[in-house]
């Protein structure tokens, strides 16, 4: 009664295609198939960035797998054939593992690179990112910014950079059609005449780095001697009012202050007849039905109302 | 396996040139940078350059001048020129390959001596 | 320059010790980019620990490092007669590239 054993895949390897961190992982079957011809076979992939605790897993018949990569650091992979218990009248075979690494070899010390990156997407309209210089960098270092996310042909540079003293330190990016909801992939590299320049890649999705406009139309209602209605509006542009959340500050006079969150656009104050006044301003953050993060916009202007005028439904700015 | 061995050290006069070499097998120098470090006889470990994968170079300034390195990928060697050499030069040199921003392989270190 | 000072610049020390070795940076240093080194007499340096904390390929894990910013440690939990050396650190994050200037250790 022979064992049965099965080869691993051949010729696996990494292939980067030039989109900053989204790698190809592909192989070809193993030699000496025609024994399970009515068998499908598939293939246990592990792959990690170098330095991370766990691998990703993945079961596939494909002969190739597309995934995302931090290129700062290498990457590792492995792979093995499985052939299924019903190929074999018994147990799941598997065979060795094929194993295989790729990194950018790096150039420039550390130092070189762009310090301190910082991307917004404000009001989910205009991403912005910007940077300093490496440390000890000197004033003929200049830095590129590519991107690339799914549904472009390829990288494309920044066309118009934020600049200092004439070097690059920023980039405002053109419309990006269909760019939220799937990882956006950075590279900043540099070039000097004085010494070689790091690069630094960086990966965000769009919709976890908005930083809304603050709200507009700020108002008062009286609801009952002792509630007060604020009210306030969506800001113009593209967010629906079901991605806010929003943070409240009272102020009555002058002296106690009430914060709140709350996920619509209005806020009912309980108050005293003794209240003379109140101001409140507000600022609005994506939820987490529509991002995993955000950024709280500006506060908005401040809407004040003094009591004795609330009849008369006078408002000051 | 990886290796790396220098050569090329010797004893040179004052004001004198010397060319070390370091030949590496086990892999590629399209792939890795090398580094030179020099340690003066019981002295501590000093850093004079790199050589990366892409072939542009770094060094330590304070011996950019008299230093400089270079590499022939055909022949997966690298090379320390180094002019103008002084007393204070003697050291042992040793050739290391980078790797994930570390030092993970060293050659057995060449002896140049500076002396008249 | 960063200036990476060592102490002690030599200790004795008997099999069995807990070794500790202090390196102090003059300016902070990515944790990343704080690697330790071990040289035997007549011999080239050897990579023992990089990225402060992480052991090379093939070194006993009785050697640990730690820290952040200026101050990184190296231990050796109980030392082995194979460990008597000398050991430096070296940060990789800005140019020049530096070392500590070594922690000779010896037996008491």
């Known amino acids: 009664d022979t064992e049965i054993k099965v080869n691993p895949p051949q010729d696996f390897e990494i292939v980067d295609p030039g989109y900053l961190g989204y790698l190809y992982l592909q192989w070809q079957p193993p030699l000496s198939l025609d024994h399970f011809k009515e068998c499908t076979v598939e293939y246990e992939l592990k792959y990690r960035n170098i330095g991370s605790e766990t691998w990703k897993t993945i079961i596939t018949k494909n002969l190739h797998y597309k995934d995302g990569f931090d290129l700062n650091k290498g990457i590792e992979a492995k792979i093995h054939t499985l052939l299924p218990w019903q190929c074999t009248n018994g147990s799941e075979v598997q065979s060795s593992w094929a194993e295989t690494t790729y990194w950018i070899s790096p150039q420039g010390i550390p130092e070189t690179k762009v310090q301190d990156m910082d991307c917004v997407y404000y009001n989910w309209q205009y991403l912005l990112c910007s940077w300093k210089p490496g440390i000890g960098v000197l004033l003929d270092t200049n830095y590129n910014l590519f991107y690339w996310y799914e549904g472009l042909d390829h990288a494309l540079q920044c066309v118009d950079y934020i600049k200092a003293d004439g070097q690059n330190i920023g980039c405002r990016f053109p419309y990006l059609e269909a760019s939220d909801y799937k990882d956006f992939y950075i590279c900043v590299n540099g070039s000097s005449e004085n010494k070689p320049i790091r690069s630094s890649y960086f990966t965000f999705q769009l919709q976890n780095i908005v930083k809304p406009l603050p709200p507009v139309y700020l108002t008062f209602t009286r609801e009952s001697s002792c509630e007060i209605k604020l009210k306030w509006s969506i800001p113009l542009g593209p967010i629906p009012a079901r991605c806010f959340d929003y943070e409240i500050e009272i102020r009555e006079d002058d002296t106690t202050l009430v914060t709140a969150t709350v996920e619509n656009e209005t806020y009912t104050l309980k108050t005293t007849n003794e209240t003379r006044q109140l101001c409140f301003v507000v600022r609005s953050k994506v939820n987490i039905y529509c991002s995993d993060d955000g950024i709280w916009s500006e506060w908005s202007d401040k809407q004040c109302w003094e009591g004795e005028d609330l009849s008369k439904k006078t408002l000051l700015r | 396996e990886v290796q790396l061995v220098e050569s090329g050290g010797g004893l040179v006069q004052p004001g004198g040139s010397l060319r070390l070499s370091c030949a590496a097998s086990?892999?590629?120098?399209?792939?890795?940078?090398v580094h030179w470090v020099r340690q003066a006889p019981g002295k501590g470990l000093e850093w004079v350059g790199v050589k990366w994968a892409g072939g542009s170079t770094d060094y330590n300034s304070a011996l950019m001048s008299r230093f400089t390195i270079s590499k022939d990928n055909a022949k997966n060697s690298l090379y320390l020129q180094m002019n103008s050499l002084r007393a204070e030069d003697t050291a042992v040199y040793y050739c290391a390959r980078d790797h994930r921003d570390a030092m993970d392989y060293w050659g057995q270190g060449t002896l140049v001596t500076v002396s008249s | 320059d960063i200036q990476m000072t060592q102490s002690p610049s030599s200790l004795s020390a008997s099999v069995g010790d807990r070794v500790t070795i202090t390196c102090t940076a003059s300016l902070s240093v990515s944790s990343t980019y704080l690697h330790w080194y071990q040289q035997k007499p007549g011999k080239a340096p050897k990579l023992l620990i990089y990225?402060?904390?992480n052991l090379a390929s093939g070194v006993p894990s009785r050697f640990s490092g730690s820290g952040s910013g200026t101050d990184f440690t190296l231990t050796i939990s109980s030392l082995q007669p194979e460990d008597f050396a000398t050991y430096y650190c070296?940060?990789?994050?800005?140019?020049?590239?530096?070392f500590g200037g070594g922690t000779k250790v010896e037996i008491k």
């Open positions: 990225s402060t904390s």
């Open positions: 086990g892999f590629s120098l399209t792939k890795y940078g």
């Open positions: 070296h940060q990789y994050h800005r140019s020049p590239l530096t």
